[in-house]
Amino acid sequence: DLLNHKKFLLLPPVNFTIKATGLAQVLLHWDPNPDQEQRHVDLEYHVKINAPQEDEYDTRKTESKCVTPLHEGFAASVRTILKSSHTTLASSWVSAELKAPPGSPGTSVTNLTCTTHTVVSSHTHLRPYQVSLRCTWLVGKDAPEDTQYFLYYRFGVLTEKCQEYSRDALNRNTACWFPRTFINSKGFEQLAVHINGSSKRAAIKPFDQLFSPLAIDQVNPPRNVTVEIESNSLYIQWEKPLSAFPDHCFNYELKIYNTKNGHIQKEKLIANKFISKIDDVSTYSIQVRAAVSSPCRMPGRWGEWSQPIYVGKERKSLVEWH
């Protein structure tokens, strides 16, 4: 048993490098120590991420991909390990780092928020839907007046540069709009957003943020909401939101608001229709919203409410389309 052999020495890996391979993405690479004796044994590697956020894991490979913000730099260590059922032998650590990019922290953007929407494909695509992305941010408190910011996103291996910005009074970019993107929420891929900047007066610190596509996806409101009154019943129907997901992937929440007495009736539904008893003296406001449910994907947050439809006293029995 090599682990019990007093003289057995584990040597650290060599040629440990950290290379930025994309927005908020690094590749750690190392080689086995060429001087290691008994190289036929099952060596593993213990990787420790020291910054920006501590993490550690074991791997048999000699490279590892990390997805993480890089505006504060990145530092990691790796060592050779040899495991048995009752003990683990480890070499000394080797370390490497990526320096933080230049610029004072107060010059980078703050309060970065991003949301995605499903929209109808605007040109001859194989798929009828595409995903738009909107991001907004605040100018850094110490950013000079001539600062200009530029946004990029990476999803998987593809990176896109923003072409459509909104600006503040000083003509600085403070929001970005991508009418179509390659973002989807099929897997566990994270959306990386990177904003860098330029100024004649100071170095502008870049900023990276990772988003879960599930968390930022804004589900559209249900379509074609119709309301009919028959005697003392409300018949409410709607169609699924504009979405690449099929009908069975949605849960709905219905809100019936009695404007006379302020009473709100809320119903959680799987079906896309509902019948409710009403009185004949009140006016009602009806709204529906949707959320994607399992098993289609991890349940997401509720989408936007549909436009209110008003029915009841002093309003004709009607059908309204939205």
Epitope: R127, L158, T159, E160, F182, G187
Partner: antibody, heavy 118, light 106 residues
């Protein structure tokens, strides 16, 4: 009708360079990513390179990185592939193809043969 | 990189027969899979995308299925014009093709 027409290829010596072009018509060129795909004689298909809408991002297979450069001229609706330091492993029919990021290649050119030999 | 393993490499079938071609991805590609048909001396033509969506103009005897890492192309009632080489392709992480399946008539 979507059409992709590659320029003539030809015989080139190892270590030399060659530039391929692909003229696109029948669609809004700047609305799509474009790619080059190659096929060695009697072999399978191999993605070579992809370029984004405005040419700001380019992606390459490992074996051509640093030797091949994909570019585009949206005003001329033309895609290019500059191939340097060619070797016999680059001998193939080169196809220009339309796609859009994480999409398949929905239209292909007729292909152009590039032979690297002394 | 994602590897695509296609099987069989070649097959012979009779007219009117049903043909199945398999494609195995080295990791989950979330149905980002296409099938192409290539006839000798011609460029490939897209048949199926997103694992099971039929490209416009492609006969309905072609169908695709599968999820995760395992996918298949089915040709119902084989016609003489279906003699070709078929390739699968993933487009979830870069773009890689299977080795191809050469389909011949018995």
């Amino acid at each position: 009708e979507v059409q992709l027409v590659e320029s003539d290829g030809g015989l080139v010596q190892p270590g030399r360079s060659l530039k391929l072009s692909c003229a696109a018509s029948g669609f809004t060129f700047s609305d799509f990513y474009m790619a080059w795909v190659r096929q060695a004689p009697t072999k399978g298909l191999e993605w070579v390179a992809t370029i984004s809408y405005d040419g700001s991002s380019a992606y390459y297979r490992d074996s051509v990185k640093g030797r091949f450069t994909i570019s585009r001229d949206n005003a001329k609706s033309t895609l290019y592939l500059q191939m340097d330091s060619l070797s016999s492993e680059d001998t193939a029919t080169y196809y220009c193809a339309r796609h859009d990021g994480y999409y398949p290649f929905d239209y292909w050119g007729q292909g152009v043969m590039v032979t690297v030999s002394s | 990189d994602i590897r695509m393993t296609q099987s069989p490499a070649s097959l012979s079938a009779s007219l009117g027969e049903t043909v199945n071609i398999e494609c195995l991805a080295s990791e989950d590609i979330y149905s980002d899979l296409a099938w192409y048909q290539q006839k000798p001396g011609k460029s490939p033509q897209l048949l199926i995308y997103d694992a099971n969506s039929l490209q416009n103009g492609v006969p309905s005897r072609f169908s695709g299925s599968g999820s995760g890492t395992q996918y298949s192309l089915k040709i119902n009632s084989l016609q003489s014009e279906d003699v070709a080489t078929y390739f699968c392709q993933q487009y979830n992480n870069y773009w890689t093709f299977g080795g191809g399946t050469k389909l011949e008539l018995k």
